[in-house]
């Protein structure tokens, strides 16, 4: 408060929120995602509200499709600017499927080990994106529960850019990924009109992770 | 639990048909991209085509063996899978599995099989 | 198409034994390779996915390994209840195939 006992700058902008968060990002990048400049530009606008460091948050990328890859570990980088340059060269890398279960998966076992740089007492947080209906359903409820028990708090976004151009019903879609995020489901499912769209929930998702913290 | 359950096998003449179903259970089998795979007495495993699903334009692919003579189709609202079989031969005798295909895990899921004979 | 070719095609083994399967596919199909345990009268079981990924509830004595067009299958120590026929299968591109299956059988 001010000496005229005024409220000032009560609320502290999200990037300059110090507080310990291990994010995983789990993109997908098959062949429907278009255009990948849409979700680069989500990317660093994400990334860029927040304070990375060794201690403080650590972000790791994991992009899947057909298969997966890592793009870079928790620890690969030690500051907002180098994920920032790291995130812009992402390349899309296409797939024939779209293996939901199998990013889930993945970043589970692997991007969320110590070897990668997870740190021990610090809460896991994975952020979904996808555009489509998973090619592994099949395997997604074991997936989830198996997050569940290890504490990982899920955001799941989907992009119904694919549906909406191609005239699809999104229902079964959208309850998909609706069945992948955290409860309440309200405050960690998002859904965008197209790719276009992502920068338009940065604001509201950067605020719903920190809220993890406070 | 996820789980295929194959039916229709059976006795019948060369030249006959017969079709095969397979009831998807515990997923969203609309999801999936579905395959039948058969095994002759005493051979090994035999791929006998594929289904896409819906929104990847429910596309088939089949064997060289049995192109023109099988079909395969699917119906989403009773999630089951099916295998139309036409101008039987001898030698499309075997057990018939159904699937779930991705092409990471290649056959992750499996149906118990359902054995056709084709015999005079 | 790719062709698949398991060797051997049959085996004697005894409990306790390590076992080395192999499987040559035809041109490069990256890791796309699949392992598959089978029992007389029963359906194929997965085993090992991606060349080298163990499918969950699969002993840990199943390893695969490869990639490209050499594979190999290894059973570190012979169970009674692994004497059954391994098949080696390509997703790599369609038509999936299947090698010929190798027949592990008690010494």
């Known amino acids: 408060v001010s000496p005229t006992f005024q409220v000032v700058n009560s609320i502290a902008p999200v990037q300059e929120c110090s507080t310990q968060l291990d994010i995983v990002i789990v993109l997908d990048g098959s062949n429907s995602i278009y255009p990948w400049d849409s979700v680069t530009a989500f990317l660093n606008d994400l990334l860029e509200r927040m304070d990375i460091g060794p201690k403080q948050t650590q972000v790791g990328i994991v992009q899947y499709g057909e298969n997966v890859t890592h793009e870079f570990n928790l620890n690969k980088y030690s500051s907002t600017e180098e994920v920032l340059v790291a995130a812009k060269k992402i390349v899309q890398r296409g797939g024939r499927q779209t293996m939901t279960a199998l990013g889930i998966d993945t970043a589970r076992k692997e991007a969320f080990t110590e070897a990668r740089g997870a740190r021990r007492g610090v809460k896991k947080v994975m952020v979904i994106v996808t555009d489509g209906e998973s090619h592994d359903n099949h395997r997604l409820k074991q997936v989830i529960q198996d997050c569940e028990d290890e504490n990982i708090q899920r955001f799941s976004i989907a992009i119904l850019g694919s549906y909406n151009r191609g005239n699809l019903s999104t229902e079964k879609f959208v309850e998909e990924i609706k069945s992948i995020a955290s409860e309440p489901t309200e405050k960690h499912f998002f859904n965008v009109s197209d790719e276009l769209a992502l920068v338009t929930i940065v604001k509201t998702l950067g605020e719903r992770i920190f809220a993890l913290e406070a | 639990e996820v789980q295929l359950v194959e039916s229709g096998g059976g006795l019948v003449k060369p030249g006959g048909s017969l079709r095969l179903s397979c009831a998807a259970s515990?997923?969203?089998?609309?999801?999936?991209?579905m395959s039948w795979v058969r095994q002759a007495p005493g051979k090994g495993l035999e791929w006998v085509g594929r289904i896409k699903r819906k929104t990847d334009g429910e596309t088939t692919d089949y064997a060289a063996p049995v192109k023109g003579r099988f079909t395969i189709s699917r119906d989403d609202s009773r999630n089951t899978l099916y295998l139309q079989m036409n101008s039987l031969k001898t030698e499309d005798t075997a057990v018939y599995y159904c699937?779930?295909?991705?092409?990471?895990?290649?056959?992750?899921?499996w149906g118990q099989g359902t054995t056709v004979t084709v015999s005079s | 198409d790719i062709q698949m070719t398991q060797s051997p095609s049959s085996l004697s083994a005894s409990v306790g034994d390590r076992v080395t399967i192999t499987c040559r596919a035809s041109?490069?199909?990256?890791?796309?390779l699949n392992w598959y345990q089978q029992k007389p009268g029963k359906a194929p079981k997965l085993l090992i996915y991606a060349a080298s990924s163990l499918e969950s509830g699969v002993p840990s004595r199943f390893s695969g390994s490869g990639s490209g067009t050499d594979f190999t299958l290894t059973i570190s120590s012979l169970q009674p209840e692994d004497f059954a026929t391994y098949y080696c299968q390509q997703s790599y591109s369609t038509p999936p195939t299947f090698g010929q299956g190798t027949k592990v059988e008690i010494k």
């Open positions: 041109q490069s199909i990256n890791n796309y």
């Open positions: 699937t779930i295909y991705t092409y990471y895990y290649g056959m992750d899921v």
């Open positions: 515990g997923f969203t089998f609309s999801n999936a991209w």
